[in-house]
């Protein structure tokens, strides 16, 4: 259940700018788009954190800055999408431009669509600012096209 997702398993790749945080993904027989045979829908989400500055620390997953920001974002998304269909997030990437955050969200198929992913994220902006000191802007959400990119790090058990 979603309440078990707080303890993410993590894998890091110090040679790249991404960090995967992939909780175990369970399967369902719901149907929606985009879809995999395992019953999981993925959504790509990008947003700006305008009150932070990008620096080289965000290219190194071993740094405190990287780890603290990654942890806060993971906690924030567990809070935003605390509902039965949310399976977790993966493949957090940081980019220059204040700080641009890119990540992939996983849900049970049929439990949410791209518009509601964005609505629920936008609804949380005020709380993100007060609870995590993250000023969020320029939110963009899109379906992850099938087949899901193998490099993304979002492994789905068969």
């Amino acid at each position: 259940t979603p309440t078990t997702l707080a303890s993410h398993s993590t894998k890091t790749d110090a040679s790249s700018t991404h960090h995967s945080s992939v909780p175990p993904l369970t399967s369902s027989n719901h149907s929606t788009s985009p879809q995999l045979s395992t019953g999981v829908s993925f959504f790509f989400l990008s947003f700006h954190i305008s009150n932070l500055q990008f620096n080289s620390s965000l290219e190194d997953p071993s740094t405190d800055y990287y780890q603290e920001l990654q942890r806060d974002i993971s906690e924030m998304f567990l809070q935003i999408y605390k509902q039965g269909g949310f399976l977790g997030l993966s493949n957090i990437k940081f980019r220059p431009g204040s700080v641009v955050v890119q990540l992939t969200l996983a849900f049970r198929e049929g439990t949410i669509n791209v518009h509601d992913v964005e609505t629920q994220f936008n609804q949380y902006k005020t709380e993100a600012a007060s609870r995590y000191n993250l000023t969020i802007s320029d939110v963009s959400v899109s379906d992850v096209p099938f087949p899901f990119s193998a490099q993304s790090g979002a492994g789905v058990p068969g």
Partner: antibody, heavy 117, light 107 residues
Framework: QVHLQQSGAELVRPGSSVKISCKAS????????MNWVKQRPGQGLEWIGQ????????NYNGKFKGKATLTADKSSSTAYMQLSSLTSEDSGIYFC??????????WGQGTLVTVSE | DVLLTQSPAILSVSPGERVSFSCRAS??????IHWYQQSTNGSPRLIIK???ESLSGIPSRFSGSGSGTDFTLTINSVESEDIADYYC?????????FGGGTKLELK
């Protein structure tokens, strides 16, 4: 299977309060939002708000802020809605409903609240 | 708030006919619309989610379509058990809102 059992009909006086319940079974109560929906006699549906039993977080329709208070008891898997300062406009059927955060697949049978002298 | 307008208020049909219900949103809501059926003295029942996604246990004669602001629920061959009120609900904006409903009745 999932079942939502609501408390029985209430006849209450104007100005008083009433607390109705929705006992859930057949799923992990803490992990799904519980919603409340109002239906006036012969009228349509109005979303009142929702509570996440896992941590007590709530979202309300602004129209019902100050009127409805949502709570949940994890130990008994029961959600509650208290309606205060009742008037005739509060008469109607109140449903609890569970789905995901924003749509509802499981519904209680409804609780009729009648506000009358 | 997102306003949902359903039309007509009442639809009169004969068994076996094809019938369509309309739901119009006051702003673009993508495909974040859900349809419910409510029989007399009963609780609402979800019959279509996210504009066109079917649910297990719902007869295949029910289908949904549309995106943006205009949505349609279709029953391709009405049966007597389908006589009920039908509501659309949006989830693209808070608060969640319902349409005013369309009553399906027999001629």
């Amino acid at each position: 299977q999932v079942h939502l059992q609501q408390s029985g009909a209430e006849l209450v006086r104007p100005g008083s309060s009433v607390k109705i319940s929705c006992k859930a079974s057949g799923y992990e109560f803490n992990s799904f939002w519980m919603n409340w929906v109002k239906q006036r006699p012969g009228q349509g549906l109005e979303w009142i708000g929702q509570i996440y039993p896992g941590d007590g977080d709530t979202n309300y329709n602004g129209k019902f802020k100050g009127k409805a208070t949502l709570t949940a008891d994890k130990s008994s898997s029961t959600a509650y809605m208290q309606l205060s300062s009742l008037t005739s406009e509060d008469s109607g059927i109140y449903f609890c409903a569970r789905g995901y955060k924003a749509w509802f697949i499981y519904w209680g049978q409804g609780t009729l609240v009648t506000v009358s002298e | 708030d997102v306003l949902l307008t359903q039309s007509p208020a009442i639809l009169s049909v004969s068994p076996g006919e094809r019938v369509s219900f309309s739901c119009r949103a006051s702003q673009n809501i993508g495909t974040s619309i859900h349809w419910y059926q409510q029989s007399t003295n009963g609780s609402p029942r979800l019959i279509i989610k996210y504009a066109s996604e079917s649910l297990s246990g719902i007869p295949s004669r029910f289908s949904g379509s549309g995106s943006g602001t205009d949505f349609t629920l279709t029953i391709n061959s009405v049966e007597s058990e389908d006589i009920a009120d039908y509501y659309c609900q949006q989830s693209n904006g808070w608060p969640l809102t319902f349409g005013g409903g369309t009553k399906l009745e027999l001629k």
